[in-house]
């Protein structure tokens, strides 16, 4: 058993049918010595008396808010949560496996640049009685500071019969140098509590591996005289690290017909312009990627050919 | 249709082309190592990230773009000094910091070159003959060093008398390639920045 926060405790249980559970001793936070009784949640049934209460915690029915009273007055509370260990592996009931980029990916994180700022998000089908708390650091043995905000509900989607809820959090490394070569990964830890169930999820990454630039901005077409060709031009996104000559991007320019089945023409360039043939009803899209370290491509920025 | 990116013309900052080749070569070598050594811990998540140049060179600090010198977090240690007679210095107006930067890059390359050559000698003794260092990568390191053209003492190749532990050697190769790829990215960024300046 360990303390999650004041008056909230997590009991770790080896979770299998007929498991013996864990013996837990609760102590009433009071100078009083006698006349103390204990109850669980809203029930008025007295579970025991005395300054301490010993209970055998086996299942969720044994978890909850234990309260010690004296003469009708509440003295203190202890909330017991359960953390299930199933065959040596902590349960992951609360969050959905996003399966991207690999199986057992519960937290996904992205950064728009090398400033040390990043966003993480996760999915759940649970809509109520759910709380998250997020901590982060650079490295784990001698952790350096990363400050995270509060997790917020960022999207709701309908998936088949289920509703899916997306939560996200923004974090910022306290002293980040965009040019630094990372040798210690960023660690992100999310505590999730659903009713009386506690779970924790972690992710470990280097900022360089989670970079996803914003799409190029100011995408424009300039028709070339007496030709079906156009000059496409764009600019680096505002959110990208500067100077751009050091933090360079490479671009992919795509000409896509109206039908998805039509052949796509693609050109790769390090410049911020390209000459392409503009077909009728086609659209031109441009996306960006770090020129020297192949992390994710940005989303496409698009303009119609007409 | 994939159109290749145009290679820089010879009039450009002379080292840019070499640094791009270096990054390509080390990335290819790392990919080959990951595939060949699939039963070894060779992914970024599994290895310890060690920098053999730590406390010996200070490339990141010495090569910091001017725009980032205002960032307190980027100014940890900028005290290391180096010899300053490189041929990549495009004009006489080149600052002392640029000379320091290029000289630091040269020292990095020299250290990695020695490590890789020592490691290759060990790998050649492996009866499994599982993996060797790409000669192209070693050649590209050499070319960039020549382009930088710094005079410095030659570091003798380390020779080891004891029987090599091939498992450890292959894990060390992965560690070295990951670190060298990160340094090659920094070198490429620096050359791109200097070229634009």
């Amino acid at each position: 058993i360990w303390e999650l926060k004041k008056d909230v405790y997590v009991v770790e249980l080896d979770w299998y049918p007929d498991a013996p559970g864990e013996m837990v001793v609760l102590t009433c936070d009071t100078p009083e010595e006698d006349g103390i009784t204990w109850t669980l949640d809203q029930s008025s049934e007295v579970l025991g008396s005395g300054k301490t209460l010993t209970i055998q915690v086996k299942e969720f029915g044994d978890a909850g808010q234990y309260t010690c009273h004296k003469g009708g007055e509440v003295l203190s509370h202890s909330l017991l949560l359960l953390h299930k260990k199933e065959d040596g592996i902590w349960s992951t009931d609360i969050l959905k496996d996003q399966k991207e980029p690999k199986n057992k990916t519960f937290l996904r994180c992205e950064a728009k640049n090398y400033s040390g700022r990043f966003t993480c998000w996760w999915l759940t089908t649970i809509s109520t009685d759910l709380t998250f708390s997020v901590k982060s650091s650079r490295g784990s043995s001698d952790p350096q500071g990363v400050t995270c905000g509060a997790a917020t509900l960022s999207a709701e989607r309908v998936r088949g019969d289920n509703k899916e809820y997306e939560y996200s959090v923004e974090c910022q490394e306290d002293s980040a140098c965009p040019a630094a070569e990372e040798s210690l990964p960023i660690e992100v830890m999310v505590d999730a509590v659903h009713k009386l169930k506690y779970e924790n999820y972690t992710s470990s990454f280097f900022i360089r591996d989670i970079i996803k630039p914003d799409p190029p901005k100011n995408l424009q077409l300039k028709p070339l005289k007496n030709s079906r060709q156009v000059e496409v031009s764009w600019e680096y996104p505002d959110t990208w690290s500067t100077p751009h000559s050091y933090f360079s991007l490479t671009f992919c320019v795509q000409v896509q017909g109206k039908s998805k089945r039509e052949k796509k023409d693609r050109v790769f360039t390090d410049k911020t312009s390209a000459t392409v043939i503009c077909r009728k009803n086609a659209s031109i899209s441009v996306r960006a990627q770090d020129r020297y370290y192949s992390s994710s491509w940005s989303e496409w920025a698009s303009v119609p050919c007409s | 249709r994939n159109l290749p990116v145009a290679t820089p013309d010879p009039g450009m900052f002379p080292c840019l082309h070499h640094s791009q080749n270096l990054l390509r070569a080390v990335s290819n070598m790392l990919q080959k190592a990951r595939q060949t050594l699939e039963f070894y811990p060779c992914t970024s998540e599994e290895i310890d990230h060690e920098d053999i140049t730590k406390d010996k060179t200070s490339t990141v600090e010495a090569c910091l773009p001017l725009e980032l010198t205002k960032n307190e977090s980027c100014l940890n240690s900028r005290e290391t000094s180096f010899i300053t007679n490189g041929s990549c210095l495009a004009s006489r107006k080149t600052s002392f910091m640029m000379a320091l930067c290029l000289s630091s890059i040269y020292e990095d390359l020299k250290m990695y070159q020695v490590e890789f050559k020592t490691m290759n000698a060990k790998l050649l003794m492996d009866p499994k003959r599982q993996i060797f260092l790409d000669q192209n990568m070693l050649a590209v390191i050499d070319e960039l060093m020549q382009a930088l053209n710094f005079n410095s003492e030659t570091v003798p190749q380390k020779s080891s008398l004891e029987e090599p532990d091939f498992y450890k050697t292959k894990i060390k190769l992965c560690i070295l390639l990951h670190a060298f790829r990160i340094r090659a990215v920094t070198i490429d960024r620096v050359m791109s920045y200097l070229n634009a300046s």
């Epitope: 080896d14 979770w15 299998y16 049918p17 007929d18 498991a19 299942e59 969720f60 260990k85 199933e86 065959d87 040596g88 592996i89 009931d93 690999k102 199986n103 057992k104 089908t125 | 039963f39 811990p41 599994e46």
Partner: antibody, heavy 115, light 112 residues
């Protein structure tokens, strides 16, 4: 006393369907994940499928994906395996089992797919 | 489809020490716990070892399990006639958990 009692096995022709049941008692069935495991005659153990305690997630071996469906009725304390498009290679003793460091197995039920 | 490899058979005379190996990889035994089962003919498997080296109550202490790196082993010190059975190791793969990975199985024969 944890008990898993299986039923539903038998002889079936290729291409036909069969449903296996596993009745649980002696524990809070709705709190635990459950597996199906099979063993072809003279062969080793092969995992077939898993269902979470609340039925929210189901996992299948590639060999049965799209043909077998694992389900549970927590109000009846029963686990099911619906088997469709059966093949000769599905012939085996099928076991249900609880998930956890200590596990309990059903007695097994024989499924024979033969024309 | 088995990724946990066991020797097909091992044998010993009563009182001898018999060991069965179970070889896997970094993504299964290397990152997860191992169980061992004993299966007598015509019966369901019986749990012998869980969490690599733990014995459930009721299992004789002549059975012991261990794990090192990407391999695990089961030892029977002082093998007895009633130990003649099939033995299976079981683990998980970190990418496909909770799918169970079983070993190929080992037939233990007690001679004499």
């Amino acid at each position: 006393q944890v008990q898993l009692v299986q039923s539903g096995g038998g002889v079936v022709q290729p291409g036909r369907s069969l449903r296996l049941s596993c009745a649980a008692s002696g524990f809070t069935f709705s709190s635990y994940g459950m597996h199906w495991v099979r063993q072809a005659p003279g062969k080793g153990l092969e995992w077939v499928a898993f269902i979470r305690y609340d039925g929210s997630n189901k996992y299948y071996a590639d060999s049965v994906k799209g043909r077998f469906t694992i389900s549970r009725d927590n109000s009846k304390n029963t686990l099911y395996l619906q088997m469709k498009s059966l093949r000769a290679e599905d012939t085996a003793v099928y076991y249900c089992k609880t998930h956890g460091s200590h596990d309990n197995w059903g007695q097994g039920t024989m499924v024979t797919v033969s024309s | 489809s088995y990724v946990l490899t066991q020797p097909p058979s091992v044998s010993g005379t009563p009182g001898q020490r018999v060991t069965i190996s179970c070889s896997g990889g970094r993504s299964n035994i290397g990152s997860n716990t191992v169980k061992w089962y004993q299966q007598l003919p015509g019966t369901a498997p019986k749990l012998l070892i869980y969490l690599n080296d733990q014995r459930p109550s009721g299992v004789p202490d002549r059975f012991s399990g261990s794990k090192s790196g990407t391999s695990a082993s089961l030892a029977i010190t002082g093998v007895q006639a009633e130990d003649e059975a099939d033995y299976y190791c079981q683990s998980y793969d970190r990418g496909t958990h909770p799918a169970l990975l079983f070993g190929t199985g080992t037939k233990v024969t007690v001679l004499g």
